[in-house]
């Protein structure tokens, strides 16, 4: 039979690969069927019988076409500072991302391993660079003529209001106070906010390599304590 119409298991022609969704079993020396995502190989193929696949058990998954003897365990439940953006199913691992107001301090292949609260800039300091999904807020001292009177991870330094007659000059943490009933020019009341980082998950559509490479493993590295940056408060 030509390779196109052979049924698994079959011996491939010398120099030929197996076809779509098949793998070469070294022991049987045959091309055999892979198991689909959500399944694993319960019984490996032989020269006369094809792979027997079985569904993954609860809390386990396989994301790729495979011939693994056991499904992979889903990651542990998301912690209180995280939200579950993808549930554990037979075909995909659980994905945890950081909740609003937090950023990912230690990422993993998909999602986040360790979240940390976004730095808050104390009065006299404003946000120089807003936080993102994977980076903390950077604070900077308010330049002359600007101020911030809040402890916030989103507020930037705002210009002092300009008075006809100044009662109390503004400083880095306080606006100017005017004696006249209305200032010449005033910023709109209320703090200026920077947008919170939005936790989005890019679709994982990486193509499937020939599964003959060893699986990668990640290790959680201990994180030593780090002093807060100037102008920030630990929360």
């Amino acid at each position: 039979l030509p390779a196109q119409v052979a049924f698994t298991p079959y011996a491939p022609e010398p120099g030929s690969t197996c076809r779509l969704r098949e793998y070469y079993d070294q022991t049987a020396q045959m091309c055999c069927s892979k198991c689909s995502p959500g399944q694993h190989a319960k019984v490996f193929c032989t020269k006369t019988s094809d792979t027997v696949c079985d569904s993954c058990e609860d809390s386990t998954y396989t994301q790729l076409w495979n011939w693994v003897p056991e499904c992979l365990s889903c990651g542990s439940r998301c912690s209180s500072d995280q939200v579950e953006t993808q549930a554990c199913t037979r075909e995909q691992n659980r994905i945890c991302t950081c909740r609003p107001g937090w950023y990912c301090a230690l990422s993993k292949q998909e999602g986040c391993r360790l979240c940390a609260p976004l730095r808050k800039c104390r009065p006299g300091f404003g946000v120089a660079r807003p936080g993102t999904e994977t980076s903390d807020v950077v604070c900077k001292p308010c330049a002359p003529g600007t101020f911030s009177n809040t402890t916030s991870s989103t507020d930037i330094c705002r210009p002092h209001q300009i008075c006809n007659v100044v009662a109390i000059p503004g400083n880095a943490s306080m606006d100017a106070v005017c004696t006249s009933t209305s200032p010449t020019r005033s910023m709109a009341p209320g703090a200026v906010h920077l947008p919170q980082p939005v936790s989005t998950r890019s679709q994982h559509t990486q193509p499937t390599p020939e599964p003959s490479t060893a699986p990668s493993t990640s290790f959680l590295l201990p994180m030593g304590p780090s002093p807060p940056a100037e102008g920030s408060t630990g929360d």
């Epitope: 120099g15 779509l20 790729l64 193509p207 499937t208 020939e210």
Partner: antibody, heavy 119, light 107 residues
Amino acid sequence: QVQLVQSGAEVKKPGASVKVSCKASGYTFITYDINWVRQATGQGLEWIGWIYPRDGNTQYAQKFQGRVTMTRNTSISTAYMELSSLRSEDTAVYYCARGDRDYGYFDVWGQGTTVTVSS
Amino acid sequence: DIQMTQSPSSLSASVGDRVTITCRASQDISNYLNWYQQKPGKAPKLLIYFKSKLHSGVPSRFSGSGSGTDFTLTISSLQPEDFATYYCQQGNTLPLTFGGGTKLEIK
């Protein structure tokens, strides 16, 4: 970034052979099939076959069996497609494309190599 | 070999329109249907694989549906950069085969 860069245009006489190269970069060359697909001017796409760079094994479309030879040089992450006994109907743009053998798609393509067969 | 038939072969539409292209397989191909976009003088680009999975970087206005033998590619709101030729391709059985293409032109 992941890319495939092909050799330049070729003009051949009927009966001759042509060898097109495809250099991969930005990923592990040996872990993905390299497919070859051709497209005659104003026509659709036609799959020729694939090579698995890890072991050099191939899978050819029946139509091209006996006329096509796919090889690779893993040290320079390059795949080759040689087509022999050329005829005018082989005039086309030849593309190499990285393939996925589970879903049968091509996710990264070379820029194409124009092969003209003319006497 | 599995024959893939696309319709229409050409289509005129305007920016903002919703467009549907269909692809029919000569036999059941399960969900192993992929879609590509090709612009003149360029290589095809993968848009959708396994019937409805969006390839990375592809805008969400592209979507795929269908099963068995009949499939559709939908562009929810045409953008100027979407005018191109679209090809379907089956990934179910060797040899891998493509549809004849649908040329999407500006009305």
